[in-house]
Interface confidence: low
């Protein structure tokens, strides 16, 4: 999918009121530093493709990503702000929602999620380097 | 060390112009979001305007008691800041602090502020 | 507009625990973020993102947020904390929004 058309705006302030949240919640008792960011973007619709990616291909020891509470955010997100992209996620991410377990979080997946992390913030706003 | 350094205030009459700088020191100042804040005598703290980094399109929002008649600008060769203040109002006085934003939109690095002063 | 509310006035006994309210609609949808201002002096972030303490900023700092308040908690009040104190929010239509501070006073 080709995100260039859509309303990043509204999908950064989707991300600022609630996604954020939920991101740092699932990483919650993970120290900031224990992570390096491997994963970059370029620009918005790049980065939203790497989002994409990362939230919802399974890979390699973490398979479950997409049953989160932000993956389904970030779907219905996408849903609504990007011309285009399937309008059947919404009713896929409401039913994963009813039938969601609790999957046990894997140092991959924290792995995953901190990269996902560094992806929203570059999105948002420049690679900060702090001092 | 992050430092922030403000210049250019002083005593300006009503409608008159006045243009403050904020030199940056210690930090990549181009990969950073900058801010004016202001605080009027006995007062709290009010937000004037910032401007973006050059890789979010380095575009300006303003307070609406501001707008159209501040400018906010930046030069990242030489790591400096700018506020170009016209018209300015009786109500413009106040210590204006520049100050660099960090994720989630706080600011965590200010300057020790300028005093401008607009008075006939 | 969006509009934070503070308390004019907080006070508190040394070495006892303080906390400095800040409210708003669906605040606890929104990063809030403190500061403290002493007189004369730039304001200093304590607290960013509801509850994370910048480096040199004492653990006696802490924050929540839920709801529609914000709390700063100051543990172990110290002189050195008489300040003025203010907590912030990023808004979609007012941008960034300052409440209109707290005076904390520690009584000895």
């Known amino acids: 999918y080709d995100f260039t058309n859509c309303d990043f705006e509204k999908i950064k302030a989707a991300y600022l009121s609630t996604i954020s949240k939920d991101l740092i919640t699932y990483m919650s008792g993970t120290k900031s530093t224990e992570f390096n960011n491997t994963v970059s973007c370029s620009n918005r619709p790049h980065c939203l493709t790497e989002i994409q990616s990362l939230t919802f291909n399974p890979t390699a020891g973490c398979a479950s990503l997409a049953k989160e509470m932000f993956a389904m955010k970030t779907k219905a997100a996408l849903a609504i702000w990007c011309p285009g992209y399937s309008e059947t996620q919404i009713n896929a991410t409401q039913a994963m929602k009813k039938r969601r377990k609790r999957k046990v979080t894997t140092n991959k997946c924290l792995e995953q999620v901190s990269q996902l992390q560094g992806l929203w913030r570059r999105f948002n706003r420049p690679l900060l380097k702090q001092q | 060390e992050v430092q922030l350094v403000e210049s250019g205030g002083g005593l300006v009459k009503p409608g008159g112009s006045l243009r403050l700088s904020c030199a940056a020191s210690?930090?990549?100042?181009?990969?950073?979001?900058m801010h004016w804040v202001r605080q009027a005598p006995g007062k709290g703290l009010e937000w004037v305007g910032h401007?973006?980094?050059?890789?979010?399109?380095?575009?300006?929002d303003y307070a609406a008691p501001v707008k159209g008649r501040f400018t906010i600008s930046r030069d990242d060769s030489k790591n400096t800041l700018y506020l170009q203040m016209n018209s300015l109002k009786t109500e413009d006085t106040a210590v204006y602090y520049c100050?660099?934003?960090?994720?989630?939109?706080?600011?965590?690095?200010w300057g020790q502020g300028t005093l401008v002063t607009v008075s006939s | 507009s969006y509009e934070l509310t503070q308390p004019l006035s907080v006070s508190v006994a040394l070495g006892q625990t303080a906390r400095i309210t800040c409210s708003g609609d669906?605040?606890?949808?929104?990063?809030v973020h403190w500061y403290q201002q002493k007189p004369g002096q730039a304001p200093v972030l304590v607290i960013y993102g509801d509850n994370e303490r910048p480096s040199g900023i004492p653990e006696r700092f802490s924050g929540s947020n839920s709801g529609n308040t914000a709390t700063l908690t100051i543990s172990r009040a110290q002189a050195g904390d008489e300040a003025d104190y203010y907590c912030q929010a990023a808004d979609w239509v007012d941008f960034y929004v300052f409440g209109g501070g707290t005076k904390l006073t520690v009584l000895f």
């Open positions: 669906n605040i606890g949808s929104k990063y």
């Open positions: 100050a660099r934003e960090i994720y989630y939109y706080a600011f965590d690095s």
């Open positions: 401007i973006k980094s050059k890789t979010d399109a380095g575009t300006t």
């Open positions: 210690g930090f990549t100042f181009s990969d950073y979001w």
